[in-house]
Amino acid sequence: MSILKIHAREIFDSRGNPTVEVDLFTSKGLFRAAVPSGASTGIYEALELRDNDKTRYMGKGVSKAVEHINKTIAPALVSKKLNVTEQEKIDKLMIEMDGTENKSKFGANAILGVSLAVCKAGAVEKGVPLYRHIADLAGNSEVILPVPAFNVINGGSHAGNKLAMQEFMILPVGAANFREAMRIGAEVYHNLKNVIKEKYGKDATNVGDEGGFAPNILENKEGLELLKTAIGKAGYTDKVVIGMDVAASEFFRSGKYDLDFKSPDDPSRYISPDQLADLYKSFIKDYPVVSIEDPFDQDDWGAWQKFTASAGIQVVGDDLTVTNPKRIAKAVNEKSCNCLLLKVNQIGSVTESLQACKLAQANGWGVMVSHRSGETEDTFIADLVVGLCTGQIKTGAPCRSERLAKYNQLLRIEEELGSKAKFAGRNFRNPLAK
């Protein structure tokens, strides 16, 4: 069934910034997709097109991207009469029409919006759930429910505390199924809220963009201690492990790292990559830290390689790889990390996201599907993670509706699968292993 009509509009993301929404019509109905947006965008990402008109939304409008869809992409796709199940053909056509390496003509936000809507339409056209359609596109015969990585403590550039490291996450790997993982996550979250209120006061339980807390912690180890305490008080010490997103590029300073980068600059306190690696290793020894994302700067390749070889845990590339096949290939060759953070809007189309995932998995890496800090009510990534069998998803805390939208969709998927539902659990790094 071909596309009858496409209409794009500006809507708002969870931070009150404009983003792109696409309505795609076939004879089977209306299919809607909305594009997420990152707070910090890596320098190697596909370009998110913004208007840069300071008189409107502080320059963050997306009317140009919307116009590209309505005036250029839509007429081309409608006239070509391509079947919505032909995801790769449609994505390739849009990429060729754009003609730039980083999608800077139309904007990755324009191309992705249409790509997501096409994928949703393709599933209905085939009469299968979206996750099953994605599994088919990826060549997967089975589907797997992921372990959620709940970002419950926030630091880094976007938090108003002194904490250098960006995210402290809990992963309920010992849960029997996704529903139990959600229960564990929610109960730990509420215990954490009480623990933080007790130590830092009620104001400290205000939540950030992704639903996590940002108490005025100074030491990164204190973040781990709070998690340990909340997990313990909830009674789940044996079922929950810890993940971190350091976002070290944010405090990389001329070859070294400033863990106190929110204070006035003082080069004498900078530490070397080896010293930072030793700090991580002390965390791994003292707490059940099983995953660290972006432990070093996106171009500090040597530090990545050395750490991944010796740490014995999951080392996730986000700023390092930005879901970019060229960066992933380099990281694979250099053994820089062992897990890809998959963000559909970093690469800008469903097809390329699937290719990036398959490239990582073919090289023995794990893959963690991720939201962005500026999210919408769109639940595409919930179906994506199930269809791609990556076994892990991070889409915020169990708080804020744009985060829960994804988790709730995963609950629905698990319910729909019934006895056929398989939960990644402790195999979250390699859920397809027999």
Epitope: H190, N191, E225, K228, T229, G235, T237, K285, Y287, P288
Partner: antibody, heavy 119, light 107 residues
Amino acid sequence: EVQLVESGGGLVQPGGSLRLSCAASGYTFTSCVMNWVRQAPGKGLEWVAYINPYNDGTKYNEKFKGRFTISRDDSKNTLYLQMNSLRAEDTAVYYCAREGFYYGNFDNWGQGTLVTVSS
Amino acid sequence: DIQMTQSPSSLSASVGDRVTITCRASENIYSYLTWYQQKPGKAPKLLIYNAKTLPEGVPSRFSGSGSGTDFTLTISSLQPEDFATYYCQHHYGTPYTFGQGTKLEIK
């Protein structure tokens, strides 16, 4: 100053029941996980159970599950341990212990109350 | 259940000596370990938590180290008031279990 005072111990016959109390003062009772720990004469320490004030969640040493029940009365700032079907091997000093801010560390203990199970 | 094994079970030492007590867990407990001191007829007293952190009021001659499965309590220079029984305890999930204790006696 934090104070924990146990009471309710004494001599009881095998198969009998006893309810131990622990009166807490000097801190916000509802903010801390509370534990019972016991010590048989001349022996080491053995954790019995805890209760979490945030959700009234309880955890027991499997050894005592079904016979012992931990509870609390926040209006009286008091922790309880109901012990049923007592056996000779339950003879011990029973301590209530407050879990500090950080999980799993008992930073304040009562003086203990002796329970003797004998016919 | 996780087993905690202390060694030695008893130890004779003199004032001023450096003393080391070890505690081994039957599986990885990270740094989820606490040390207590108990004197005869008294309740235990928190000495070290998180394997190496001293609470306020505990003298600096006490120190803790280790992570994973092997832990150590060290008293750098024994004082008369240090003669007591010492227990390690894990809190890596329930049931919390204690070591069997190490009795430190005057030589």
